[in-house]
């Protein structure tokens, strides 16, 4: 299993939307991809979950564009606020 986030950093103005890309490899038949936000304290905050057999997930300002064939799961954060400045991680799980 493997997860790759190619963007090391992104800069965006407030009020816009940003897309964070994540590519993965897995041999699992059924799985979930999770997006987390890491606070300066290093605490990880769960944002949204995408199931391998589910429609694109959406929760508040977070939405996922899931392309199963391309093994791509992009997180879009809309209506950006200063508090969104952070490190974002995607994770793969069964």
């Amino acid at each position: 299993q493997k997860v790759t986030q190619a963007q090391s950093s992104v800069s965006m103005p407030v009020r816009k939307a940003v897309t964070l890309n994540c590519l993965y490899e897995t041999s699992w038949w059924s799985y979930y991809i999770f997006w987390y936000k890491q606070l300066p304290s290093k605490e990880m905050i769960f944002l949204i979950r995408q199931g391998s057999d589910e429609q694109n997930a959406k929760s508040g300002r977070y939405s996922v564009n899931f392309k199963k064939a391309a093994k791509s799961v992009a997180l879009t954060i809309s209506a950006l606020q200063l508090e969104d400045s952070a490190k974002y991680f995607c994770a793969l799980g069964e």
Partner: antibody, heavy 117, light 111 residues
Framework: DVQLQESGPGMVKPSQSLSLTCTVT?????????WHWIRHFPGNKLEWMAY???????DYNPSLKSRISVTHDTSKNLFFLNLTSVTTEDTATYYC??????????WGQGTLVTVSA | NIVLTQSPASLAVSLGQRATISCRAS??????????MHWYQQKPGQPPKLLIY???NLESGVPARFSGSGSRTDFTLTIDPVESDDAATYYC?????????FGSGTKLEIK
């Protein structure tokens, strides 16, 4: 879920002002998005008119700037459109919508406004 | 103002076939690594419905038959395969630069 609903007069006389209200339920208008007015003309043209942000800042289409204002009432979760000196060219269906950098995901059902003597 | 030119103005596509709609911007709508172009479907008496955001992202709840592609000034909405419920007018819209602008619309008829 987020819902928007436009209200106002269906008929306005030329040279008068048009005032519309957008009632937002399911989300606070101070919660981080921008709140827009868009109109749809009979010939199928869509025109963005203006927005008011969650913080109260506004931006207007330059083609309407001299005639338009948008305000909000955060205590009632409403925002408003005022368009002055209307003509028959302002006859359209008026929509309010929410936007946060990735398109207008939420719209009201629209209200038809006819400008006629 | 950024002008969005849609083509064709109308098209008729047989059930089960592919429909392709083009949107060309008078200047680039790319910024900060995103293409700020979106696609909507509108049926008579209804507000526009967001289908695709940021050029290629499928809005939640929209069938995977809809897809978007493109960057800078040239964008495409593809519906494959077309179903009878897809008869509607489709619009592109940019929000890279104020004032936000919409395309002139493409009316899709299903044969």
């Amino acid at each position: 879920d987020v819902q928007l609903q436009e209200s106002g007069p269906g008929m306005v006389k030329p040279s008068q002002s048009l005032s519309l209200t957008c009632t937002v339920t399911g989300y606070s208008i101070t919660g981080g998005y921008d709140w827009h007015w868009i109109r749809h003309f009979p010939g199928n043209k869509l025109e963005w008119m203006a927005y008011i942000s969650y913080s109260g800042s506004t931006d207007y289409n330059p083609s309407l700037k001299s005639r338009i204002s948008v305000t909000h009432d955060t205590s009632k979760n409403l925002f408003f459109l005022n368009l002055t000196s209307v003509t028959t060219e302002d006859t359209a269906t008026y929509y309010c919508a929410r936007e946060g950098g990735r398109g207008f995901a939420y719209w009201g059902q629209g209200t038809l406004v006819t400008v006629s003597a | 103002n950024i002008v969005l030119t849609q083509s064709p103005a109308s098209l008729a596509v047989s059930l089960g076939q592919r429909a392709t709609i083009s949107c060309r911007a008078s200047e680039s709508v790319d910024g900060y690594g995103n293409s700020f172009m979106h696609w909507y479907q509108q049926k008579p008496g209804q507000p526009p419905k967001l289908l695709i955001y940021l050029a290629s992202n499928l809005e939640s709840g929209v069938p995977a038959r809809f897809s978007g592609s493109g960057s800078r000034t040239d964008f495409t909405l593809t519906i494959d395969p077309v179903e009878s419920d897809d008869a509607a007018t489709y619009y592109c819209q940019q929000n890279n630069e104020d004032p936000f602008t919409f395309g002139s619309g493409t009316k899709l008829e299903i044969k």
